[in-house]
Amino acid sequence: CTCVPPHPQTAFCNSDLVIRAKFVGTPEVNQTTLYQRYEIKMTKMYKGFQALGDAADIRFVYTPAMESVCGYFHRSHNRSEEFLIAGKLQDGLLHITTCSFVAPWNSLSLAQRRGFTKTYTVGCEECTVFPCLSIPCKLQSGTHCLWTDQLLQGSEKGFQSRHLACLPREPGLCTWQSLRSQIA
């Protein structure tokens, strides 16, 4: 299973649920669905309040039980380490795959943390991060921001990923903006 890691803003906008959580239990495989279930302890929710309701608590995250069909494998054995998890809701359950954005909270830049906490949501409605994977690539719309990190750095951990968000500048126009300047 291969997929291009998304810009964190894309991950935020395309996910039903974005939370901070610790992986606390041994994974279990469901004998009916063939999904693997990880027990988690949610510490923060950044997106999904409407979908879940205010009192909701996510206790498990689900993923296919085999790598070749994009199952997510959690490598960390540190049960106190917090992870940012951006996933999809299916029948009220949080699902993730290899292609989902799952990252140690401590590995995120301060700008990314700010993005997940409050800024990425501003760009979800109108703006689109548009991946540039090969030259030439050009903007197809004024609401697109060209994402060139992978082209220039060969990595999703480039400057645009770590420090910028694609946000509305004016109606019909989105531009890369520094998340540093978004401090309230």
């Epitope: 669905t33 999904y35 085999m66």
Partner: antibody
Framework: QVQLVESGGGLVQPGGSLRLSCAAS????????MSWVRQAPGKGLEWVSG????????FYADSVKGRFTISRDNSKNTLYLQMNSLRAEDTAVYYC??????WGQGTLVTVSS | DIALTQPASVSGSPGQSITISCTGT?????????VSWYQQHPGKAPKLMIY???NRPSGVSNRFSGSKSGNTASLTISGLQAEDEADYYC??????????FGGGTKLTVLG
């Protein structure tokens, strides 16, 4: 009682195709993932393929990926394995299993010219 | 391509206890509590004897027990009987290969 009965095995030439069936009874078929496991003559067990209860998730061993297709018909309580581009090394007794707790008696597939 | 390592053969006299080991890695045996053991008599289908490391299905004699330490699982048969003579296979869940088996162990009951 819980029962699985395989059928469809036989002699086939290399490059040929065969479709195995597994008729299930005695339990709620759609509530269980099912698997195919094979055993070459005088050898050990090898997992081949698996399918979730609703047929949404499907897994294959690398040795059969792209050649074998697993499917199920929950209305008929039947599991299938479509085997294409068969090779001599696919010769084995093929068992269907409910998850891995109940097994059928197996059906022999021989690939030979 | 055998994923889990079992001794090719073990033997014991009636009434004795024997143990069959099954060694994997932290990615299979060591990483999950999904180890099963099967008994297979010649020309017959495998029969589940132990699941989830140490659980016995109903109808299986309590002379059969399972355990796990690190990356190695074990099947112990106490009070060995003639009908225990068979091949025994261990199996484990593995995230990459889904389900992996050991190469099998031939148990011979002496005498």
């Amino acid at each position: 009682q819980v029962q699985l009965v395989e059928s469809g095995g036989g002699l086939v030439q290399p490059g040929g195709s065969l479709r195995l069936s597994c008729a299930a009874s005695g339990f709620t078929f759609s509530s269980y993932a099912m698997s195919w496991v094979r055993q070459a003559p005088g050898k050990g067990l090898e997992w081949v393929s698996g399918i979730s209860g609703n047929g949404v998730l499907i897994f294959y061993a690398d040795s059969v990926k792209g050649r074998f297709t697993i499917s199920r018909d929950n209305s008929k309580n039947t599991l299938y394995l479509q085997m294409n581009s068969l090779r001599a090394e696919d010769t084995a007794v093929y068992y269907c299993a409910r998850w891995f707790d109940v097994w059928g008696q197996g059906t022999l597939v021989t690939v030979s010219s | 391509d055998i994923a889990l390592t079992q001794p090719a053969s073990v033997s014991g006299s009636p009434g004795q206890s024997i143990t069959i080991s099954c060694t994997g890695t932290s990615s299979d045996v060591g990483g999950y509590n999904y180890v099963s053991w099967y008994q297979q008599h010649p020309g017959k289908a495998p029969k589940l004897m132990i699941y989830d490391v140490s659980n016995r299905p109903s109808g299986v004699s309590n002379r059969f027990s399972g355990s796990k330490s690190g990356n190695t699982a074990s099947l112990t048969i106490s009070g060995l009987q003639a009908e225990d003579e068979a091949d025994y296979y261990c199996q484990s869940y593995d995230f990459v290969r889904f389900m992996v088996f050991g190469g099998g162990t031939k148990l011979t009951v002496l005498g």
